[in-house]
């Protein structure tokens, strides 16, 4: 899915209002320095691509994130604010249901959610260029410069 046409500011609002709190709850008791952030993103569409991948794609050692509250709210936000997103996720949802029935919090999952927090932080606060400056290299975000 190409996230270019999403309403980034609405997704940001959804994240700040609810999703972030669910991530904090999931990570409660974990030190912020416990994991090194190795996943990064360069612009808002790219951040959403990485967020989707980490949230919904089962990985070795962590197959259960898709059933977490933050994941369900992320899915809802993307479905509402990204045109055509829901249609692309029907097959993925079926696969998810088959993949895992129970929620298990592993150290690998905690590490993955720590990565997610970094991706969301980057998504929310890209360094957007002002009109007239030329030091920002990310063309995908140019038209969002007034919605920092």
């Amino acid at each position: 899915y190409d996230f270019t046409n999403c309403d980034f500011e609405k997704i940001k609002a959804a994240y700040l209002s609810t999703i972030s709190k669910d991530l904090i709850t999931y990570m409660s008791g974990t030190k912020s320095t416990e994991f090194n952030n190795t996943v990064s993103c360069s612009n808002r569409p790219h951040c959403l691509t990485e967020i989707q991948s980490l949230t919904f794609n089962p990985t070795a050692g962590c197959a259960s994130l898709a059933k977490e509250m933050f994941a369900m709210k992320t899915k809802a936000a993307l479905a509402i604010w990204c045109p055509g997103y829901s249609e692309t996720q029907i097959n993925a949802t079926q696969a998810m249901k088959k993949a895992r029935k129970s929620k298990v919090t592993t150290n690998k999952c905690l590490e993955q959610v720590s990565q997610l927090q970094g991706l969301w932080r980057r998504f929310n606060r890209p360094l957007l260029k002002q009109q007239g400056s030329s030091d920002y290299k990310d063309d995908d975000d140019k038209h969002h410069h007034h919605h920092h």
């Epitope: 904090i24 320095t33 952030n37 990064s40 932080r121 606060r125 030091d135 920092h148």
Partner: antibody, heavy 120, light 111 residues
């Protein structure tokens, strides 16, 4: 403990340059926007600019764009602010600050400040 | 640039009394239903400290005598019962649009 430790006070001549450092510890430096703020005597706070250590992207206040340069050294988790062509009105305390954990955009951790005095 | 104007410039309030500081933005700092306005407290010789984020959310470890309200262009910081340790300069900050801008500051003293 999450903290930012800045370099010591500097006294500079007009026309020269100053480079202030800000060493981060206790958090994953590369994933947080780092900001610089000026506080001149008897005046308010003024945003200079910000840098994302992950890839070095910067955003500047146009007022400082021609004279301020923000850089980072990821290997030492240090942010730098260089100010060139110094003049008397650059006399101020300069702070580095980290954006919050959640992308709210507030500055939750600040350095102790570096006093820069520009005098002939 | 969005200009942030605080009022008053200085304020003297008796201990235990209410203190109110206003901040007006030259244009709206709201986006998608959220107000991207923060408040800081700065004491002499110290860096600023976050008090409230997004207009009304209390920062970590901040006593609940501090509260904030407002949206769009008009915001208010209230201290319900002034304590001696609240003597400081208070700043509002908008982060909705680059460049990020602060108010000129309001100096709060004890009457």
């Amino acid at each position: 403990e999450v903290q930012l430790v800045q370099s010591g006070a500097e006294v500079k001549k007009p026309g020269s340059s100053v480079k202030v450092s800000c060493k981060a510890s206790g958090f994953t430096f590369s994933t947080y926007n780092m900001h610089w703020v000026k506080h001149a005597p008897g005046q308010g706070l003024e945003w200079i600019g910000a840098i994302y250590p992950g890839n070095g992207e910067t955003s500047y206040n146009q007022k400082f764009k021609d004279r301020a340069t923000l850089t980072v050294d990821k290997s030492t988790s240090t942010a730098y602010m260089e100010l060139s062509s110094l003049r008397s009105e650059d006399t101020a305390v300069y702070y580095c600050a980290r954006e919050d954990d959640y992308g709210e955009g507030y500055f939750d951790v600040w350095g102790q400040g570096t006093t820069v005095t520009v005098s002939s | 640039d969005i200009v942030m104007t605080q009022s008053p410039d200085s304020l003297a309030v008796s201990l235990g009394e209410r203190a109110t500081i206003n901040c007006r933005a030259s244009e709206s700092v709201d986006n998608s239903g959220l107000s991207f306005m923060h408040w800081y407290q700065q004491k002499p010789g110290q860096p600023p400290k976050l008090l409230l984020y997004r207009a009304s959310n209390l920062g970590s470890g901040i006593p609940d005598r501090f509260s904030g309200s407002g949206s769009g262009t008009d915001f208010t910081l209230t201290i319900s019962s002034l304590q001696a340790e609240d003597v400081a300069v208070y700043y509002c900050q908008q982060i909705n649009t680059d460049p990020l801008t602060f108010g000129q500051g309001t100096k709060l003293e004890i009457k």
